[in-house]
């Protein structure tokens, strides 16, 4: 066992001479992003104050390619890198094409309306006038490709004029536009060469030891890894912590059960019920507030102040009033919960599916004519699953080195 331990320690650290280095650098696991949209069936009725009705469309599946660049080894046992992602539509795995039309809330109009609720009435009336002139409405009919990767919208220019420096978009707006062909920030992580217990843990993200999106030190902490590998020799008492630039926060998953993936022993980690709980139910989350109902997390502070919320798909594990407020939602543990299956000896994921939902808080705002009589509601826009499973040559090598070899050595 100590010989095996030595082998593991030697081969999991981030070091060009280690077996797993190339696996860390260019993840050989095929990752897929499956996106499900909530097609709004009754936009006119919502504007009159009726309950929203949605229909899930999808999945629209993309192959996700990741590669690390600007890899710099520092002299404090850390390595810095940028990880770039590109997405390629997979028609054969998808239920529909990127040219499918989806009726969706107009995030720019409805988001701006909620953001301006407490602004002077004059500004709100100017916005109404602008929206009318520009033909901007509360709901839009756009293609999947446009929603994902961006569409030209004159409102982007208008928002940049009235709210300078707040909006990360120029000319085009798309929900996943910032992810494609771009990096998720500069990560500096421990290599484990000098101290294996800190391997993969994030030292800094974009040069920061903590973020300032939230209202408490605990919520602002950058904890865990960058979300791809974890320290070796896990036990059922271990938790799986990682910093997610997309959620602008650290997340902690808990051990659920042991299992086997393609002959390799694994630990399954899942989201605790408290992950998106509000501060009154789970006090440590108070720093993520102001909160609405429990089970959704306000990400407006890191998403250009738009009233966007992150949750489990279909408001799984959230306050039931959220799913009841929208017709067409059916939360289901099997279909909508996330998991990571980790090989506990190495801390390397074998099979995972991270599922999250993005929703928009919308309501009628006095002075913004386009909001009509919309009753306050958190309306799901889409949910996605980022999934990957080790396969092929990588799996074979992994199985040989970490399952077969130790068994042979044991005997």
């Amino acid at each position: 066992p100590s010989l095996i331990k030595q082998q593991v320690l030697k081969n999991v650290r981030i070091d060009p001479s280690s077996l797993s280095f190339n696996m860390w650098k260019e993840i050989p696991i095929p990752f897929y992003l499956s996106v499900y949209f909530f097609d709004v069936m009754n936009p006119s009725e919502i504007l009159k104050g009726e309950k929203p009705q949605v229909r899930e469309r999808g999945p629209y599946v993309y192959r996700e390619f990741r590669h690390k660049s600007n890899i710099t080894f520092n002299n404090n046992d850390t390595v810095s890198f940028l990880e770039y992602r590109t997405f390629q539509f997979q028609p054969s795995k998808s239920h529909g094409s990127e040219s499918d039309y989806i009726v969706m809330p107009n995030i720019l109009v409805l988001g701006a309306a909620v953001m301006m609720e407490n602004k002077p009435m004059t500004l709100k009336l100017i916005m109404t006038l602008a929206f009318t002139t520009l033909g901007e409405r509360a709901f839009m009919n756009r293609t999947v490709g446009e929603i994902m990767w961006g569409y030209k919208d004159p409102l982007v220019n208008l928002i940049n004029k009235y709210f300078p420096g707040m909006f990360p978009f120029k000319d085009k707006f798309g929900l996943f536009a910032e992810l494609n062909n771009s990096d998720s920030g500069l990560f500096t992580v421990f290599t484990g060469v000098q101290n294996i217990s800190r391997i993969h843990l994030v030292d800094k993200w974009n040069g920061l030891s903590k973020v300032d999106f939230w209202h408490s030190d605990q919520c602002n902490m950058i904890n865990g890894t960058s979300g791809q590998m974890w320290p070796p020799f896990m036990t059922p008492e271990s938790s799986l912590e990682f910093y997610s630039p997309e959620a602008c926060r650290s997340m902690k998953l808990m051990y659920k059960e042991s299992g086997v993936f393609e002959g390799i022993p694994t630990y399954r980690f899942v989201a605790p019920k408290t992950l998106f709980a509000n501060g009154s139910i789970y006090p440590p989350n108070e720093g993520f507030c102001p909160c609405l109902e429990s089970g959704i997390q306000n990400v407006s502070t890191c998403r250009f102040s738009a009233p966007l919320f992150l949750s489990h798909p279909h408001f799984l594990n959230a306050d039931p009033v959220l799913a009841e407020a929208v017709t067409g939602l059916h939360p289901n543990q099997e279909a909508h919960s996330l998991f990571l299956d980790i090989h506990p000896v190495t801390g390397i994921p074998m099979n995972c599916s991270v599922k999250l939902q993005l929703s928009l808080y919308m309501k009628s705002v006095a002075g913004i004519g386009q909001t009509g009589k919309i009753e306050p509601v958190v309306l799901p826009l889409l949910w996605f699953a980022e999934s990957g499973a080790m396969e092929g040559e990588t799996l074979h090598t992994f199985y040989t080195q970490l399952v077969l070899m130790p068994k042979v050595m044991h005997y």
Partner: antibody, heavy 119, light 110 residues
Framework: EVQLVQSGAEVRKPGATVKISCKLT????????IFWLQLAPGKGLQWMGL????????IYAEKFQGRVAITADTSTDTAYMEVSSLRSEDTAVYYC????????????WGRGTMVTVSS | LPVLTQPPSASGAPGQRVTFSCSGS????????VNWYQQLPGAAPRLLMH???QRASGAPDRFSGSKSGTSASLAITGLQSEDEADYFC???????????FGGGTKLTVL
């Protein structure tokens, strides 16, 4: 179907005041913003101001600020525009318009009110 | 003078194709979408095109709109006598914080 019905033509002397009306029919008045526009000879259309009848909030184009007052009477579903200190260059057709919720641009217009300013 | 510049008149024979231009600047057409209004003789203006290239409800598919840089255009194919009217372009102007219009083009069907 929403319609805007405007009051008839008016003739005024320079320095006088004119008040024209615009009644919304076919739907709930307070669900619509009312916009006022001027069509003067050789000047094209110009936006003058708007009102949200729900709470009587208004804004005006800089050019018309101070001389124009837009009001609304929710009991009669009518918006009004008053122009004071009339000058000969105020001779124009004045339109009220709205955008039905969910539509784009000014998609419902009144027929216009001709105002002639002449001594 | 109107903020947006339109030729005062245009003409065409029935069945022909006519195009109207509308010229602006970076603070209006250059940054934002364009609407077109049609005003038939003795009637109120009517929304014809919105968001540059979208026909308003009830507008025939003979009408199309486009934009390039700080200029926009409206085209009518298969000209008909009932198209005889004034055509106004409009856009948001972020230096004036309001919509601006052209002086209108009077179309005569020969």
């Amino acid at each position: 179907e929403v319609q805007l019905v405007q009051s008839g033509a008016e003739v005024r002397k320079p320095g006088a005041t004119v008040k024209i009306s615009c009644k919304l029919t076919g739907d709930t008045f307070t669900d619509y913003f009312i916009f006022w526009l001027q069509l003067a000879p050789g000047k094209g259309l110009q936006w003058m101001g708007l009102i949200d009848p729900k709470d009587a909030q208004t804004i005006y184009a800089e050019k018309f600020q101070g001389r124009v007052a837009i009001t609304a009477d929710t009991s009669t579903d009518t918006a009004y525009m008053e122009v004071s200190s009339l000058r000969s260059e105020d001779t124009a057709v004045y339109y009220c318009a709205t955008d039905s919720v969910g539509a784009a641009g000014f998609d419902v217009w009144g027929r216009g009110t001709m105002v002639t300013v002449s001594s | 003078l109107p903020v947006l510049t339109q030729p005062p008149s245009a003409s065409g024979a029935p069945g022909q194709r006519v195009t109207f231009s509308c010229s602006g600047s970076g603070s209006n057409i250059g940054s934002y979408t364009v609407n077109w209004y049609q005003q038939l003789p003795g009637a109120a203006p009517r929304l014809l095109m919105h968001t540059t290239d979208q026909r308003a409800s009830g507008a025939p598919d003979r009408f199309s709109g486009s934009k390039s840089g700080t200029s926009a255009s409206l085209a009518i194919t298969g000209l008909q006598s009932e198209d005889e009217a004034d055509y106004f372009c409009a856009a948001w102007d972020d230096s004036l914080d309001g919509p601006v219009f052209g002086g209108g083009t009077k179309l005569t069907v020969l």
